[in-house]
Every structure is written in structure tokens, then in C-alpha cells.
Interface confidence: medium
Amino acid sequence: DTHKSEVAHRFKDLGEEHFKGLVLVAFSQYLQQCPFEEHVKLVNEVTEFAKTCVADESAENCDKSLHTLFGDKLCTVATLRETYGEMADCCAKQEPERNECFLQHKDDNPNLPPLVRPEVDVMCTAFHDNEATFLKKYLYEVARRHPYFYAPELLFFAARYKAAFAECCQAADKAACLLPKLDELRDEGKASSAKQRLKCASLQKFGDRAFKAWAVARLSQKFPKAEFAEVSKLVTDLTKVHTECCHGDLLECADDRADLAKYMCENQDSISSKLKECCDKPLLEKSHCLAEVENDEMPADLPSLAADYVESKDVCKNYAEAKDVFLGMFLYEYARRHPDYSVMLLLRLAKAYEATLEKCCAAADPHECYAKVFDEFQPLVEEPQNLVKQNCELFEQLGEYKFQNALLVRYTKKVPQVSTPTLVEVSRNLGKVGAKCCKLPEAKRMPCAEDYLSVVLNRLCVLHEKTPVSEKVTKCCTESLVNRRPCFSALELDEAYVPKAFNAETFTFHADMCTLSEKEKQVKKQTALVELVKHKPKATKEQLKGVMDNFAAFVEKCCKADDKEACFAEEGPKFVAASQAALA
């Protein structure tokens, strides 16, 4: 349905609070370096303009598209050229090219200082002094650091952030109340950002067919009692929502997400028995709850798939008639029967089935050719099963920190050209799969582990695309979305890599090491470990363990010394010399 004024339509649908929040997020995700005050000024101007359009949809400029209105506003920023360089060239373009240009300049790794958390009393004072500004600042700081964060979900995070302060700033022990809540929001926020980044990469790099396939598989696992037509309707709507958000159309995205939540709650009976408690909640919480809802129970009497997808003589006829629908039904039927499989595995099985039909339906005896197709699935299923089993055993044996170190060594040997900060970040996150998934029952381990690894490896792909250094990484990232994880798993030691020259500066440490948090200490040590492997890629596990144990002992000794800096100055070169000798 068309509206005379799109901006008025969205303002009325979303309400002023959500409208302003979403516009702030949109602007912060596009112009990530602009100061907070500049963005607030732009948002206020857009909001005032929207109100004039609500009052009179025929007023001047109210008929313009949101991209035109928002793009024009962004292009009024005076320091665009100095701050953003070539991004300023976007402003010379017309829509839709201008918006595409802004999208291409989104920076997944902006050069912004890490957010420092002030003292609790300082935060509570700021919250009480100006709650609205405090919450806007949160939206701004998160959005500029995570330019693909799912905007309507970020509003939900902001609501939780507000609730945490409202509750804890009244508490007797403010810090004990607030800090765990902020830690939880930070960790959940990072996870949410990374998951959304994979959705956007899927849409932007592999097209909406890839996203729809992912969504069919995931929603069929969640809603195994729903009919295929129902799942397909949800997939179509969900694809529209994520396409909009990934494309910077945040008002449309939030509006359509609300419509989808409404539809799901009005049609619970034909979707899932698990939606009831979500549907009693207010909008932001409801949408979040629906997105995270647990899998419904599988219908008891599902027949074997073989009859329709292998034994039937009509397989090729049905496939030829409407390939995507037939494959979609296959994926739906397989996924609803297998909540114990990762989505990526289900997509690999669908690809294998498609490849078999492409080959066999052109053969002399198609039925004979595809009769054993389900047997071909076995190795595809066993590979992630074995991977999860082996890595969970390793995690249980080593604990999280040492498991991360094993992965650091493994991935540095595979792709030593990748920057050390990226290898440390990605390997630390890969290592978190243990604590997240290995404690789960067998039936939940693979979907948890492999789908989490896909999210983490997408982060590697996104960072690598910005500054490509490894053909192997490019190949694994671009050839096939569903085979990214197996592609990285299959990489071996890079024999062509020329070891990095030894640089003593890299292994020089100072007394400031002693005041770091446990996490920061780990990152320092893991940074050194990556540099060691880049210097000696063929070093054995035992050699590396010896060096790292010595490193830990050296740091511990100097941090206990009276004159810490003198200790580091004296013991540091000894540690470096001993390490070189051990690795020679």
C-alpha cells in the first residue's frame, strides 16, 4: 500500500520514541565517526520534519523517499570530506546509488576507542540527570561500533539497559546489582551483532536465495508442526525484514518486524505451541522472544522421506516442474525431522540432494541413479559430528583458555598472513564454543557448535574482506556459504608462508602488564603466542607449551617483584633468548 508521505507513514506506525531511536541508529551506523551531538541534532531535525508531514502529508518534500530525506540530511554534515575521505563522494550521487555508496562504506572494524565503563555512581548520576540523553548515547555508541546491528533489536537492548539502571541505581549495592546486568547485555549484544552480521553477509554476498534456504531450515526446526506453506510465508516475510535492515532501511524493517510478530501471534495455532508466552509481552520483548523461541515438539507420526524424495518415480518430474519449491519442501521436511543437525549441515544435505537430481534427472535411468542418494548423506553428517566430539573432548581436557590457545596455534598455522589482532579475536571467540555448547545434551551440541562457528568465521571473512591478505581465506569465505566451516577445518599448515622475522620488540613487556585484568592478560599472552607461531610455524605443541609456560612464570615473577619494571627489563631479554633457543 502506497502512502503520500513515507516519512509520515513510518512516524505514525512506529511512534515518536521508536522513530527517533531508529533514525539515530541509522545515522550512527552510516557516519560512525561523527560526534554524538551532531547526530542528535540531525535526528531532531528529521523528527521535526516528520511531524510537519504527519500534520500535512502534502507539505513540501514530504513525498520524498526515506533514502532521499536521510541521505540529504547526512550530506549536510560539514566535516564529511575531512572525517570520511572518499565517502563524501557518495553525496554527488543520486538515489538509489547514493545509499548503496553509504552502505559500501560501512566499517566493520572502525577505529574507535574501546568503550570504558565509568564508576557506577558516575553512571547513575548521568542516568538520573538526563535519562533520554543517556539512552541515546547508548544507542549511538553501540550502533557506530556495530554498523549492521539489528536495529529493532537494539531498541530492545536499550530498553533493558534503561531497566537495569532504573532498578539498580535505587539498590543498596548499586554495583552488585548493575555490573552483572551490564556484562550480560554486553555479551548478548556482541553475540546479537555477530549473528546479524552473518545474516547481512548471507543476503549481500550470496543473495536472498541463500538467506531463504537458511530461514527455511531454521524455521522448520523451530516450527516442525507448521505446514510448509506457513513456513514459506514466514520465510518470505523474515527475508523482507532482514533485507531492509541490512540495506539501512531501518524504519521499514522495524515496522515489518512488528507486523510479522503480530501475524505470528494471531496464527499461533498453525505455527507453534511455544509462542504463547511471547505473545503476551510488549512489542520489543515479544519480537525478541519470538526470534529466540525454543523448538516445538516434532509431530509424532512423520512418515519416512524416502517415499517422496527417493522411491517415487515422479521425483524428476516434480523437481523439473518447480525446482526451488521442491528443494524447499525437501529442506523443510528434513529440517523438521532433525533439530539435532546444524542449519549449515541441513543446507549441505539439500545442496547434495540438488546436485544428485541435477545429475540423475539427465541420466538414462534416473531412479536407479538417485536411489542411493540418502546413503551419500552419511559422510556429510558424520564430519560435523566427529568435529564436535573431538573438540569438546579437547575443551574438557584443557579448559577454555588453553583450548583457545590450541585454536590460536591451529588457525595461525592455517592462515599466518592474517593480522595478529584478528587471529586473536577470532580464535578467542572460536574457543568460546566449548563453554557455550559442550555442556549441552548430545542432540543440541551440533546445532549449537556449528552454527556458532559459522557466525565467528563470518567475522573473520568480514575483517579479511576489508584488507585481504590470504588467498586461502578469500577462497573459503567466497566459494560457498554453507561450506565455509568445513573449508577452514580442512586447511593445513601453509607451506608457502615465509616465517616472520623475529622482532624482540614484539616480545618486550613492561610493568603495566601487572595491572591488567585477567582477560587483558590473556589477550597479551595470546598475542605473543600468535607472533611466536608466525615466527616458527613448524614449532611443535610441546615447544610452544614450554615457551608459554615460561612466559607465564616470567610475568608472575615480575609482577610479584618490588621493582616490577626493573624485573621486566632484566628478565625479559632472558625470556626472549631462552624462547629462541627452545624454538631453534
Epitope: 510448509f228 506453506a229 510465508k233 517415487s312 518430474k317 519442501m329
Partner: nanobody, 128 residues
């Protein structure tokens, strides 16, 4: 919501022909059996014809229309058709299109309960 819309009904002389169309709002409907039912005044709704998923698959007809009516579908247009020839006064009824939810190999059911989505119907009147 998923929608089904019938068209093509009207008034026709006995012995004449009509072609009913049934348009589905979703591409995914090509994956399901489709059926035509009819309901004459003061009578129960009854099965007329059905076609299983995808063109060229199984068709099924009520004995009263066998040889006179032909069901077909055009998946590219998300549409099913009922070609009615040699119409009789007793064919007068509201004709309903319905879409089932069976696995792809399934035969089109005759039982109303196996059809989940229904149109509002189109009136067919055959005068003698």
C-alpha cells in the same frame, strides 16, 4: 494470510461449457494438491475433482463429472483450472477451490478435512 480466489462462474445453458480458475496468493501452493468442491442449495459440500502437486501428476474425479470435467494447473501462474463441458442443471452450485497439505507424492484427497485453505466460491448456474 494465504489466500485462494475463484473466478469464472456464471449462467450457462445445459450442454454448454465454463472454465473456472483458482488463483493462489503464494508461490508455495504449487507444492500442494488442489481440489474443487461444490455445494448446491440445501445440500452438503461435495468433492468434484482434485489434482496432486505439480502439473501432469495424479488427477481424480467424482463419478458424476468423470469424462465431462477436466482439472489442470499452471504452476507458473499459481493457478488451477476446472474445464466443465456438457453441463447439466444438476451441476448448479457454488464451486469452491481448496488447497491441501500433503506430501508431494500424495494423491488429492476427497475428504474436506484434508484441505486447509479455501476460497469464497463462485456461482455456477445451468439452466435447462
Amino acid at each position: 494470510q494465504l489466500q485462494v480466489v475463484e473466478s469464472g462462474g456464471g449462467l450457462v445453458q445445459a450442454g454448454g461449457s465454463l472454465r473456472l480458475s483458482c488463483a493462489a496468493s503464494e508461490r508455495t501452493f504449487v507444492a500442494y494438491p488442489m481440489g474443487w468442491f461444490r455445494q448446491a442449495p440445501e445440500k452438503e459440500r461435495e468433492f468434484v475433482a482434485g489434482i496432486s502437486w505439480f502439473a501432469g501428476a495424479t488427477t481424480d474425479y467424482a463419478d458424476s463429472v468423470e469424462g465431462r470435467f477436466t482439472i489442470s494447473r499452471d504452476n507458473a501462474k499459481n493457478t488451477a483450472y476446472l474445464q466443465m463441458n456438457n453441463l447439466k442443471p444438476e451441476d448448479t452450485a457454488v464451486y469452491y477451490c481448496a488447497i491441501s497439505h500433503q506430501l508431494p507424492g500424495g494423491r488429492p484427497g476427497r475428504d474436506m478435512d484434508s484441505y486447509s485453505y479455501w476460497g469464497h466460491g463462485t456461482q455456477v448456474t445451468v439452466s435447462s
